[in-house]
Amino acid sequence: QNASRGRRQRRMHPNVSQGCQGGCATCSDYNGCLSCKPRLFFVLERIGMKQIGVCLSSCPSGYYGTRYPDINKCTKCKVDCDTCFNKNFCTKCKSGFYLHLGKCLDSCPEGLEANNHTMECVSIVHCEASEWSPWSPCMKKGKTCGFKRGTETRVRDILQHPSAKGNLCPPTSETRTCIVQRKKCSKGERGKKGRERKRKKLNKEERKETSSSSDSKGLESSIETPDQQENKERQQQQKRRARDKQQKSVSVSTVH
């Protein structure tokens, strides 16, 4: 809203004159412009003890314009206001003040925070995260086969990032250990290079894992009766519950 100022006239006239320069329609030597050419805004500038009329293409900083039928006039905003809609409503405050609902404040009210970019008081925004995703498949070194103990991960998204005074965001991923029924990798799941080395290593790992756990999870291909199967399933459920309790305490979280 800063003005591209019409040059104030140099050659003043003792009485009201029509021969004015710089946007004035009428002027006097004591008060400067008295009225302006069409579409220009009339503003009174205080110079020492007297007020001088000036004609501008728009109102200067700290003033607002009113287009009356007979004159376009600039009126002062409140002292702490740089741009205003009218006397009551500021739209941009002077440096060091924050705008809140049309008023200029030196600090923001309770529950609001200062945005130092817009110099406005804004609502505090807290972090919002989505629900957790389902747990990923149990994996080890990027594979879902050839092992017994692995890790599974779940993630969530940040839906709303917090403002300066808002609550921080929670972790966006969680990892926990998992135990699966060991299954051999099919040909497609093994890399060509060092396949033998990997097979030997896996066999060694499998032997170790089998010996360290009483839960062989049906590696043998023995035939079981329905009663045996039912009994086995019951035991496995009990073990799974115990494992889940244990896993809750070994969760690893990563903050985004």
Epitope: T66, R67, Y68, D70, F85, N86, K87, N88, F89
Partner: antibody, heavy 116, light 107 residues
């Protein structure tokens, strides 16, 4: 607290006169341009007249020019509307309002009925 | 004079609905637009000035937008107290003109 209280409304015959008053308090009356806005029964808002803060200039809608006169007394914080040669179409609730580009403060209104 | 055209002239909606009222100016008025709310038997109340600025005390479910000739008033989630008549007014030129009003009724 800002208050604008209108008075002087009533039932009047066509061609007769009425004078409305508006007493202001709770703000610096002499800093504000003041206006009268009316609303005919079941109709929308219609600006009638405005007087600038120091009383030196007045503006009217075409349909009331020459019949209505807006004035103010800043020493009494009071706005007036002198209505002459009233017509049936002037029937409305008349609101006084502080007019600074927008109408920031309003009175509760006074009803003027022009009927024979 | 600048003509202001509001649409729709009346609107039925339910509590919780999102409602939009539009106001069209006959010439460019920059952002010099004001919205008022009026309830039966009461004086109008200023809601929004400078097209998008909320007046102190007005709930944040009210918002205004637009520039030039096209303006909108939006109520994001209607509350029972929002059923009223809404008016736009141009403040670009001093002789003020209002839209004809939009009456918001309960469906």
């Amino acid at each position: 607290e800002v208050q604008l209280v209108e008075s002087g409304g009533g039932v009047v015959q066509p061609g007769r006169s009425l004078r409305l008053s508006c007493a202001a308090s709770g703000f610096t009356f002499s800093d504000y341009d003041m206006a009268w806005v009316r609303q005919a029964p079941g109709k929308g808002l219609e600006w009638v007249a405005t007087i600038i803060y120091d009383g030196s200039r007045t503006y009217y809608r075409d349909s009331v020019k020459g019949r209505f006169t807006i004035s103010r007394d800043n020493s009494k914080n009071t706005l007036y509307l002198q209505m002459n040669s009233l017509r049936a179409e002037d029937t409305a609730v008349y609101y006084c309002a502080a007019h600074d580009r927008s109408f920031d403060y309003w009175g509760q209104g006074t009803m003027v009925t022009v009927s024979s | 004079d600048i003509q202001m055209t509001q649409s729709p002239s009346s609107l039925s909606a339910s509590v919780g609905d999102r409602v939009t009222i539009t106001c069209l100016a006959s010439e460019d008025i920059s952002n010099d637009l004001v919205w008022y709310q009026q309830k039966p038997g009461k004086a109008p109340k200023l809601l929004i000035y400078a097209a998008s600025r909320l007046q102190d005390g007005v709930p944040s479910r009210f918002s205004g937008s637009g520039f030039g000739t096209d303006f909108t008033l939006t109520i994001s989630s209607l509350q029972p107290e929002d059923f009223a008549t809404y008016y736009c007014q141009q403040s670009y030129k001093y002789l003020p003109t209002f839209g004809q009003g939009t009456k918001l009724e309960i469906k």
